[in-house]
């Protein structure tokens, strides 16, 4: 799997999309996980609805939400109020039993907001009750890592 880079601006929302073969993955739940180190496990952040027929319902864990268009074959993850600590390697997964197939490897990069000259105390933090649907979504810049690019920096 190549790694796709999604860039978002700090404090804004970033939308990550993972296309997949809807027939091949028919009936399967999906998940978004964070890669812990080059050889480490992928730690589950959020997964789609327990009832596959309800996969279109948005599931949320903190500032991350997931929804699955199982007919169109697109898994969408929204990272709201993007912070520097959100940067890193992730995976979109298709679950079957205790196994997980990788749909896409993702590198999330968080860019400083060039227009933000406010004090840190003035930063906008969305309310708990604010809808993900209403959140402004930064149209993410995405690209694939070039061959030979190292997805994880070598450990000293």
């Amino acid at each position: 799997h190549n790694t796709t880079v999604f860039q978002g601006v700090e404090g804004q929302s970033l939308q990550v999309s993972c296309p997949y073969d809807s027939m091949k993955h028919w009936g399967r739940r999906k998940a978004w996980c964070r890669q812990l180190g080059e050889k480490g496990p992928c730690q589950r952040v959020v997964s789609t609805h327990n009832l596959w027929l309800l996969s279109f319902l948005r599931r949320r864990n903190g500032s991350t939400a997931i929804t699955d268009d199982t007919l169109g074959g697109t898994l969408t993850i929204t990272l709201r109020n993007l912070q520097p600590h959100d940067a890193g390697f992730y995976q979109c997964q298709s679950l079957h039993g205790s196994e997980a197939d990788t749909l896409r490897k993702v590198l999330v990069e968080v860019l400083a907001d060039p227009l933000d000259h406010r004090d840190a105390g003035d930063l906008w933090v969305p309310g708990e009750s604010e809808s993900f649907e209403d959140a402004h979504v930064e149209h993410s810049i995405s690209r694939s890592l070039l061959e030979g690019e190292i997805p994880f920096p070598p450990t000293s």
Partner: antibody
Framework: QVQLVQSGAEVKKPGSSVKVSCKAS????????ISWVRQAPGQGLEWMGG????????NYAQKFQGRVTITADESTSTAYMELSSLRSEDTAVYYC???????????WGQGTMVTVSS | EIVLTQSPATLSLSPGERATLSCRAS??????LAWFQQKPGQAPRLLIY???NRATGIPARFSGSGSGTDFTLTISSLEPEDFAVYYC?????????FGGGTKVEIK
């Protein structure tokens, strides 16, 4: 602002059928599930079934299987719930509800009272 | 089917008091639990989804907690408009089911 507007109250004879409509305004009708929930007088809420976008067809609670038919007309953004072989215990307020984001029941219609009486 | 048992059936409290409503599932529903408020002659209104997340526009005095089989809806300080019937609902298993309701009435 999304709204669901239901048809008016009905009085029906036992053994007959009733068809309740639910018109949606705002949003993309086909991308959301429309569910039907009923509430007998002084009682709790009971999920009957709904049109789920993924399945493209309706899913029903076992209790109502064979007696309820849920359909939708995308051209008019209207969902319908038809209940047949009515009996007195079907006397209830019937609600339609729509997904917005997180649950099948984010947005509700105003309810339609159906009275079954001889 | 999963049975949701709500307790108490009726809660008599005064404005300003704290209300604690319970919903117990007959088997685990993970965090797939929502809370609704219903006033006489009105349709239900979504308050809480995924056990602990407030729906859009719901005041901060409403909070939900719990996971698995035991869930709680807390209203930190009752306002006059909070006196109503409250229902829990699960969608972890088919069929989707609702609890029998808790009526919060003015003492």
């Amino acid at each position: 602002q999304v709204q669901l507007v239901q048809s008016g109250a009905e009085v029906k004879k036992p053994g007959s059928s009733v068809k309740v409509s639910c018109k949606a305004s705002g949003g993309t009708f086909s991308s959301y599930a429309i569910s039907w929930v009923r509430q007998a007088p002084g009682q709790g809420l009971e999920w009957m079934g709904g049109i789920i976008p993924i399945s493209g067809t309706a899913n029903y609670a076992q209790k109502f299987q064979g007696r309820v038919t849920i359909t939708a007309d995308e051209s008019t953004s209207t969902a319908y719930m038809e209940l047949s072989s009515l009996r007195s215990e079907d006397t209830a307020v019937y609600y339609c509800a729509r997904t917005q984001e997180y649950t099948l029941f984010d947005i509700w219609g105003q309810g339609t009272m159906v009275t079954v009486s001889s | 089917e999963i049975v949701l048992t709500q307790s108490p059936a009726t809660l008599s409290l005064s404005p300003g008091e704290r209300a604690t409503l319970s919903c117990r599932a007959s088997q685990s529903v993970s965090s797939y639990l929502a809370w609704f408020q219903q006033k006489p002659g009105q349709a239900p209104r979504l308050l809480i989804y995924d056990a602990s997340n407030r729906a859009t526009g719901i005041p901060a005095r409403f909070s939900g907690s719990g996971s698995g089989t035991d869930f709680t809806l807390t209203i930190s300080s009752l306002e006059p408009e909070d006196f109503a019937v409250y229902y829990c609902q699960q969608d972890f298993h088919w069929p989707i089911t609702f609890g029998g309701g808790t009526k919060v009435e003015i003492k």
